[in-house]
């Protein structure tokens, strides 16, 4: 039994890091493998993560972590019974994938303005709370070409757009994702999308 693709890990910088790897053949990850991990400076016995299958030869493990700080470094040992298959380390702050924003809501009752709001996925005491910026994707269900991205580079989790920038009388969907420049993170997954019917009063034309 050998590791074909070494474990790579990403952290949500809060409580979970996810490690994925591939074996050289079909493997029952949960019965055959164990990923041991420990925060180096604690000098205590490692914790055990039981991996799950992720495709025939792929495995994934969700490492439970505590609050993360930038200096944290974890040791990782991948075992098959008594055989050490791979040894490595992981610094969560260097491999951050933020949590997806939640509770995306479209408020349509504000005088021809669309107000989109969502929730920051981190608690205020987490470092990323004040460092997230967002991308909002709005698209038409009727017209695949009507697809737009709005970059929200301020901290407030909201976006205002004029309803008239979208077509009237049709349905739109929106979703939002986050990233943090400070840690050069990857983008989060998209939030669940939300749907609304866009309608606004055309301005009265005077002749």
């Amino acid at each position: 039994m050998k590791v074909l693709q070494e474990p790579t890990c990403v952290s949500d910088y809060m409580s979970i890091s996810t490690c994925e790897w591939k074996m050289n053949g079909p493997t029952n990850c949960s019965t055959e493998l164990r990923l041991l991990y420990q925060l180096v400076f604690l000098l205590s016995e490692a914790h055990t993560c039981i991996p799950e299958n992720n495709g025939g030869a792929g495995c994934v493990c969700h490492l439970l972590m505590d609050d993360v700080v930038s200096a944290d470094n974890y040791t990782l040992d991948l075992w098959a019974g008594q055989q050490l298959l791979w040894k490595g380390s992981f610094k969560p702050s260097e491999h951050v994938k933020p949590r997806a924003p939640g509770n995306l809501t479209v408020h349509t009752n504000v005088s021809d303005t669309l107000l989109l709001t969502w929730s920051n996925p981190y608690p205020p005491d987490n470092y990323l709370y004040n460092h997230l910026t967002y991308a909002v994707n709005i698209w038409s269900e009727n017209d695949p070409a009507d697809f737009r991205i709005y970059n929200v580079t301020y901290l407030e989790p909201s976006l205002r757009i004029a309803a008239s920038t979208l077509k009237s009388g049709i349905s739109y969907r929106a979703r939002v994702r986050a990233w943090a420049q400070c840690y050069n993170t990857t983008w989060s997954e998209w939030s669940p999308s939300t749907k609304w019917h866009n309608s606004y009063r055309e301005p009265f034309e005077q002749h």
Epitope: L39, F41, L42, L43, S44, E45, H47, D66, D67, V69
Partner: antibody, heavy 119, light 107 residues
Framework: QVQLVESGGGVVQPGRSLRLSCAAS????????MHWVRQAPGKGLEWVAV????????YYADSVKGRFTISRDNSKNTLYLQMNSLRAEDTAVYYC????????????WGQGTLVTVSS | EIVMTQSPSSLSASLGDRVTITCRAS??????LAWYQQKPGKAPKLLIY???SLESGVPSRFSGSGSGTEFTLTISSLQPDDFATYYC?????????FGQGTKLEIK
């Protein structure tokens, strides 16, 4: 419940040696790093040394490096501090403390043993 | 080494007073901070761990807050048993470090 009981303190002359022990119970001793912390009379708390769960890694405060040795016997659930070349400034109450397996854990300390270095 | 700066070093207060002690870390330690109470001749007693978690059996008038580099211990209403010395401690490295202590005295 977690219990840590220090022993081995006493009065010793400068330059002499002393060995402190810490008997642990109520938890899986072999899973935890263990620390020594001291407090000179009327002063604050000072970290002294730590040993990893399996004894493979040891770290010391600069003030005791080269003179003190931390060790453990996991079969006896006991932590030790061998103190050589003792100085007057080593006079303190010495506490053993359990480390953490997660930074969300609770820290436990013993009641301490007094070491007096005096001629 | 992570340096912990605690203030004030001493404090006089009256029964029923609200008291706040602060602790500043020289670098980000997340929430890896504990607060202890110590009385003469006794071992330090853990009050707060993980910056804001109240240790079992500790009265709810004690509370901790903060994360990163700035932390506070608050006693909402001083009781006779609270006059003691208080220490903060970081455990964000294998070498623990402590604040210098705050001696809380009766006014």
């Amino acid at each position: 419940q977690v219990q840590l009981v220090e022993s081995g303190g006493g009065v010793v002359q400068p330059g002499r040696s002393l060995r402190l022990s810490c008997a642990a119970s109520g938890f899986t001793f072999s899973s935890y790093a263990m620390h020594w912390v001291r407090q000179a009379p009327g002063k604050g708390l000072e970290w002294v040394a730590v040993i990893s769960y399996d004894g493979s890694n040891k770290y010391y405060a600069d003030s005791v490096k080269g003179r003190f040795t931390i060790s453990r016997d996991n079969s006896k659930n006991t932590l030790y501090l061998q103190m050589n070349s003792l100085r007057a400034e080593d006079t303190a109450v010495y506490y053993c403390a359990r480390g953490l397996t997660t930074v969300r854990g609770v820290l436990y300390w013993g009641q301490g043993t007094l070491v007096t270095v005096s001629s | 080494e992570i340096v912990m700066t605690q203030s004030p070093s001493s404090l006089s207060a009256s029964l029923g007073d609200r008291v706040t002690i602060t602790c500043r870390a020289s670098q980000n330690i997340g929430s890896r901070l504990a607060w202890y109470q110590q009385k003469p001749g006794k071992a330090p007693k853990l009050l707060i761990y993980k910056a804001s978690s109240l240790e079992s059996g500790v009265p709810s008038r004690f509370s901790g807050s903060g994360s990163g580099t700035e932390f506070t211990l608050t006693i909402s209403s001083l009781q006779p048993d609270d006059f003691a010395t208080y220490y903060c401690q970081q455990y964000n490295s294998y070498s623990w470090t402590f604040g210098q202590g705050t001696k809380l005295e009766i006014k």
